[in-house]
């Protein structure tokens, strides 16, 4: 779209951003014993033409980027989303006040890409 | 940016949208013999709190949605991205004008989710 070519707006490309999440901030401190928080990270940034190799773009994202260039009113750009996620182990109280150690999948963003 | 939605809008939830892509529209008609185009589809829509089961949200997306609620200036909502992609077979001319049949992965969006 026209805004894609606005040189005065420096939009950063899709990448991983650091983010520490405190379970207290989420209001989960009463049931999560440990850890107190974790480095969750998040993905953000533009998936604009041309998509370079760092953007881990799928074939569909490459096609969608081209379609968006010509039809931005109808088709959005691909979005910047996690491509690799890691698990974390959490010690918590269950509903019966038992202490449980459980591995929660897909909690930490390790890499981002255009999807 | 100018392309952002107005806050007054009724935003639809993340879902798959139908999209037929013509290879001629992409300017690829000279090297792709068949098909003439394909149903690529795309993902679009909001990943807003609360994320319901239809949104195929990862654990990270659920956490990010909560963080966004508290810090919308700093952390974006998760984005609506493909969760299932299919391949298509394409008949095309290579650089030496040989006719090649190749399966291209991740070309068709089958399902979307909040990531």
């Amino acid at each position: 779209s026209a805004s894609d070519y606005n040189s005065s707006e420096l939009k950063t490309a899709c990448r991983k951003h650091e983010l520490y999440v405190s379970f207290q901030d989420l209001g989960w401190q009463d049931w999560i014993i440990a850890p107190k928080g974790y480095a969750a990270n998040y993905c953000d940034g533009e998936c604009s033409f041309p998509l370079n190799a760092h953007m881990n773009a799928t074939n569909h994202a490459i096609v969608q980027t081209l379609v968006h260039l010509m039809n931005p009113e109808y088709v959005p750009k691909p979005c910047c989303a996690p491509t690799k996620l890691n698990a974390i182990s959490v010690l918590y109280f269950d509903d019966n006040s038992n202490v449980i150690l459980k591995k929660y999948r897909n909690m930490v963003v390790r890499a981002c890409g255009c999807h | 940016s100018a392309s952002d939605y107005n806050s007054s809008e009724l935003k639809t939830a993340c879902r798959k949208h139908e999209l037929y892509v013509s290879f001629q529209d992409l300017g690829w008609q000279d090297w792709i013999i068949a098909p003439k185009g394909y149903a690529a589809n795309y993902c679009d829509g909001e990943c807003s709190f609360p994320l319901n089961a239809h949104m195929n949200a990862t654990n990270h997306a659920i956490v990010q949605t909560l963080v966004h609620l508290m810090n919308p200036e700093y952390v974006p909502k998760p984005c609506c991205a493909p969760t299932k992609l299919n391949a298509i077979s394409v008949l095309y001319f290579d650089d030496n004008s040989n006719v090649i049949l190749k399966k291209y992965r991740n070309m068709v969006v089958r399902a979307c989710g909040c990531h």
Epitope: D4, M70, E73 | N6
Partner: antibody, heavy 118, light 107 residues
Framework: QVQFVQSGAEVKSPGASVKVSCKAS????????IHWVRQAPGQRLEWMGW????????DYSQNFQGRVIITRDTSANTAYMSLSSLTSEDTAFYYC???????????WGQGTLVTVSS | DIQMTQSPSSLSASVGDRVTITCRAS??????LGWYQQKPGKAPKRLIY???SLQSGVPSRFSGSGSGTEFTLTISSLQPEDVAIYFC?????????FGQGTKVETK
């Protein structure tokens, strides 16, 4: 048949704002994008911006960024273009026009003359 | 931005003459070009889309050709009602840009 009817001519003072309306009929309003284009005297047509009438998404030409706002009312099948901080150089005919996916403009409004004069 | 250069800026021809208007794009736009006719005090009307496809309801004396950077609008036999301004529009990439127009008159 597809038709666009725009609001009447306006005379504005420098620094003022103008809001032009464009009522669509003859098709499903929310299925297509509406663009706004203007033509100043002796000048070529100039693209201003668009709105997706279905979801309200907009984009604007850099030449008007910050001064133009395009909106729509789906219950009234109407699109609006507001232009602020008017100068004499904004004296022009303003057109709404429909853009179908993958195509150029197929139908236009009759135009609205906006005159900026002190 | 893609620049659209249209020529001539004006022309005068006799009824029945073949008239040709050219649009040149500053970069390749494939076939993403439309031709429009605008009569005084009227809204533009699309004659040709996708560089060479005739809009429904438009007389067959109008035709379009070209691809890439060079495009032509031809009126095979000029009629009195064809007196108007004609312009091209590229819709390959935003911002969309227009030719400056060609004023067609009859002798």
């Amino acid at each position: 048949q597809v038709q666009f009817v725009q609001s009447g001519a306006e005379v504005k003072s420098p620094g003022a704002s103008v809001k032009v309306s464009c009522k669509a009929s003859g098709y499903t309003f929310t299925n297509h994008a509406i663009h706004w284009v203007r033509q100043a005297p002796g000048q070529r047509l100039e693209w201003m911006g668009w709105i997706n009438a279905g979801n309200g998404k907009t984009d604007y030409s850099q030449n008007f960024q910050g001064r133009v706002i395009i909106t729509r009312d789906t219950s009234a099948n109407t699109a609006y273009m507001s232009l602020s901080s008017l100068t004499s150089e904004d004296t022009a005919f303003y057109y709404c026009t429909r853009r179908v996916y993958g195509e150029s403009y197929d139908h236009w409004g009759q135009g609205t003359l906006v005159t900026v004069s002190s | 931005d893609i620049q659209m250069t249209q020529s001539p800026s004006s022309l005068s021809a006799s009824v029945g003459d073949r008239v040709t208007i050219t649009c040149r794009a500053s970069q390749g736009i494939r076939n993403n070009l439309g031709w429009y006719q605008q009569k005084p005090g009227k809204a533009p009307k699309r004659l040709i889309y996708a560089a060479s496809s005739l809009q429904s309801g438009v007389p067959s004396r109008f035709s379009g050709s070209g691809s890439g950077t060079e495009f032509t609008l031809t009126i095979s036999s000029l009629q009195p009602e064809d007196v108007a301004i004609y312009f091209c529009l590229q819709h390959q990439i935003y911002p969309w840009t227009f030719g400056q127009g060609t004023k067609v008159e009859t002798k």
